[in-house]
Interface confidence: low
């Protein structure tokens, strides 16, 4: 009797679905794995016999709602199915922005850009996909707990009226208006105000 | 590296309670996904609770469902479970986990969380 794999899961990152699995426990180490997934109602070969232990599953429609399954097999004997379930636009996790700073007086000017996404052309992020993306900036003076957020549709945002002189961190993760739905955060960036007094020549 | 740090733990009699607390760094404190994970000895781990850190879910396993209770402050970077009711078969080393986003219709299973505090121990006495 085969043990089925062990640990199944569906990592899937800014698009880029990756089903993992673990070996099970078994004496003999030659052990493959066929994942399949399930595509009018019949399931399709995507990885077969692989000695792998994860499976590329990026290629799926983005707005499908799936059962993925994998499979340990030793020459004719094979274990039972391990299944997951599995809707690429809701489960996908959502990957940090990026972001550029820069100082002008007592303000720091941010510029955003959206996570790409895996096997779309190279200009396609995820505003493509989800209408309702915005950006929540939060930002805190370096050193203290405070910390402030913002909310903006746009891929820029200006953080006026800051102290001067002043080192600010910052960070910003994508979210979903319409779902209360939140990416995962940027590491923090820290930037220095300057002054917006003219000081003599 | 992202750390978390459980505290609260300790020894109470049956019936009584503890508050735990698990602080992270600045990096976890809003991401999606925390959870509180115990383990007996000679048991497996049991994911207790869970909550989604926008405050729009939580989990209980049925074991705990109306005893405990899992809040977090965000502005602390703190999660904590309030146990009460506590009976001797809540004796466990309890682990603060977390990851970036939960299941959508599910608790996660104690593998999807990559992140783990240390463990506070619990000890519930008849």
């Known amino acids: 009797m085969i043990p089925p794999p062990e640990k199944v899961r569906m990592n899937s990152v800014n698009f880029k679905n990756i089903l993992q699995w673990e070996v099970p426990a078994f004496p003999k180490t030659n052990l493959t794995f066929t994942a399949q997934y399930e595509s009018y109602r019949s399931f399709q070969d995507h990885c077969k016999r692989t000695a792998s232990t994860q499976c590329d599953f990026s290629h799926l429609s983005k707005y499908g709602d799936y059962t993925v399954r994998v499979r340990a097999e030793l020459a004719d004997e094979h274990s039972e199915w391990v299944n997951v379930t599995f809707c690429p636009v809701e489960d996908t996790i959502i990957g940090p922005p990026e972001m550029q700073i820069e100082s002008l007086a007592e303000s720091l000017h941010l510029r955003f850009s959206a996570p790409q996404i895996e096997n779309e052309p190279e200009t396609w992020t995820l505003k493509n996909i989800y209408d309702s993306w915005a950006y929540r900036v939060q930002y805190w003076k370096n050193g203290t707990n405070e910390k402030f957020q913002v909310v903006s549709p746009y891929d820029s945002e200006v953080l006026r009226n800051l102290e001067p002189w002043t080192t600010y961190c910052i960070q910003v993760q994508g979210f979903l208006l319409d779902q209360n739905r939140t990416g995962e955060w940027s590491e923090p960036i820290c930037e220095r105000t300057g002054n917006d007094e003219i000081t003599p020549s | 590296q992202v750390q978390l740090q459980e505290s609260g733990g300790g020894s109470v009699q049956a019936g009584g309670s503890l508050r735990l607390s698990c602080t992270a760094s600045?990096?976890?404190?809003?991401?999606?996904?925390m959870a509180w994970i115990r383990q007996a000895p000679g048991s497996e781990r049991e994911v207790v609770a869970t909550?989604?850190?926008?405050?729009?879910?939580?989990y209980y396993a049925d074991s705990v469902k109306g005893r405990f209770t899992i809040s977090q402050d965000n502005a602390k970077n703190t999660m904590y479970l309030q146990m009460n009711g506590l009976k001797p078969e809540d004796t466990a080393m309890y682990y603060c986990?977390?990851?970036?986003?939960?299941?959508?219709?599910?608790?996660?299973?104690?593998?999807?969380?990559?992140?783990w505090g240390q463990g506070t121990q619990v000890t519930v006495s008849s």
């Open positions: 909550i989604v850190t926008d405050g729009s879910r939580t």
């Open positions: 986990a977390a990851d970036r986003r939960c299941p959508v219709s599910r608790a996660p299973y104690e593998y999807e969380l990559r992140y």
């Open positions: 600045r990096y976890i404190a809003l991401n999606a996904c």
